[in-house]
Amino acid sequence: EVEKTACPSGKKAREIDESLIFYKKWELEACVDAALLATQMDRVNAIPFTYEQLDVLKHKLDELYPQGYPESVIQHLGYLFLKMSPEDIRKWNVTSLETLKALLEVNKGHEMSPQVATLIDRFVKGRGQLDKDTLDTLTAFYPGYLCSLSPEELSSVPPSSIWAVRPQDLDTCDPRQLDVLYPKARLAFQNMNGSEYFVKIQSFLGGAPTEDLKALSQQNVSMDLATFMKLRTDAVLPLTVAEVQKLLGPHVEGLKAEERHRPVRDWILRQRQDDLDTLGLGLQGGIPNGYLVLDLSMQEALS
């Protein structure tokens, strides 16, 4: 807490300028009018205040706006944003994307701090959903942002936002997140023709069910092995050898190198050996010829 002391004669600040860097903390408290500071916040960032001086300026704003800062002030906080606590930020109502960008710029290059996480949460909740422009902005600053959201939060993402997602934005997503995002992507890209559609949907296929993979296998898509390896094991297991061959096209030869890894390993164990032999890749571990295959999935569904 800074003690309340009278401002020395002739020191009352008429505007926010560089002369204030020579003020002691108590002088800043006594001589800078909070309303003046609020209207000239855009100047603060250009002045090399010390951390201690920034604490005083924050204190003045807190006194002026005990219920939370208005957006006109928030937009020009600059480095003063780093002084804010998540509790401070929860009082804000940030609606402008420009304000969000300005504050994210301050934190650029650093990990997502609790302050930034709170800011984003407030912004998205204020908008009601994670729209395309917001997602564009957030993934530009934090490529892993999308995968930091819970499946419940991802469910509020509108399909149009999916157009902003780049393959690298999904790198850290787990299957539960892709389960939510894949249907959104299907909706978003549904007006595209076959080959264009596959290019766009490819990154999301880790959330695709068996039926969709079977349908894709009829489209000559030539899925690469990297994409195939990210598919859900339970979605791959029911695929026949012929379907996998169609799905992968010329990339089917890559199965040999991946035969010990999931989902290829588990898929091999479910296929008849003579069907695997038709691929001519030397894949081993299939069901020996003459053995009866019982499909227990029907039974599981009944129980």
């Epitope: 991802l154 399909p159 539960r176 389960d179 939510v180 894949y182 909706l187 007006n191 489209q219």
Partner: antibody, heavy 122, light 106 residues
Amino acid sequence: EVQLVQSGAEVKKPGASVKVSCKASGDTFKRYYVQWVRQAPGQGLEWMGIINPSGVSTTYAQKFQGRVTMTRDTSTSTVYMELSSLRSEDTAVYYCAESRGSGYNYFAMDVWGQGTLVTVSS
Amino acid sequence: SYELTQPPSVSVSPGQTASITCSGDKLGDKYASWYQQKPGQSPVLVIYQDNRRPSGIPERFSGSNSGNTATLTISGTQAMDEADYYCQAWDSDTYVFGTGTKVTVL
């Protein structure tokens, strides 16, 4: 034959909520995307939203955002649509429809329920 | 918001061809579907992805879509084809239905 059987007609007061069910009979081992569409008396069709086969992903029309919730109980092959804060303009027949076609990038509604009339009146 | 406009009504003699149009901005860039609805009944899908016919739908139903207009054509119209017809397309974050066309078989 595959059918979607919806719950019976409902009469609700303004401000209340209604929950309509849609149960798949026939080929219940396969699960499909289910969409909800409503039709006010003498009016056209209006899309409300869609829920994916596992029930973890929903997309709602902007108009109903915050007021509609779609869920599914995979053990009973039943999908639910709940609409809250009802007003008289919500009086309509509510249809569920499945996208069963073999397409990989479309959601045409090829199997429809019989519809559920929801009347909102004080 | 996106709008799909259809003529309110179309009249056709039995055996003749009925054409129902559906207009929307750059509709040809989207896939259009068509639904038939008879009084007191649920809608029935008759065309999807512009021109594909679901199994069980007669060959007399066909569709096309280019520019700003999608068209449903019923060749050799029969009395049983009398119904309301709705076009549908996906735009941004929602499916949009057309205003509907009542087809009357004279």
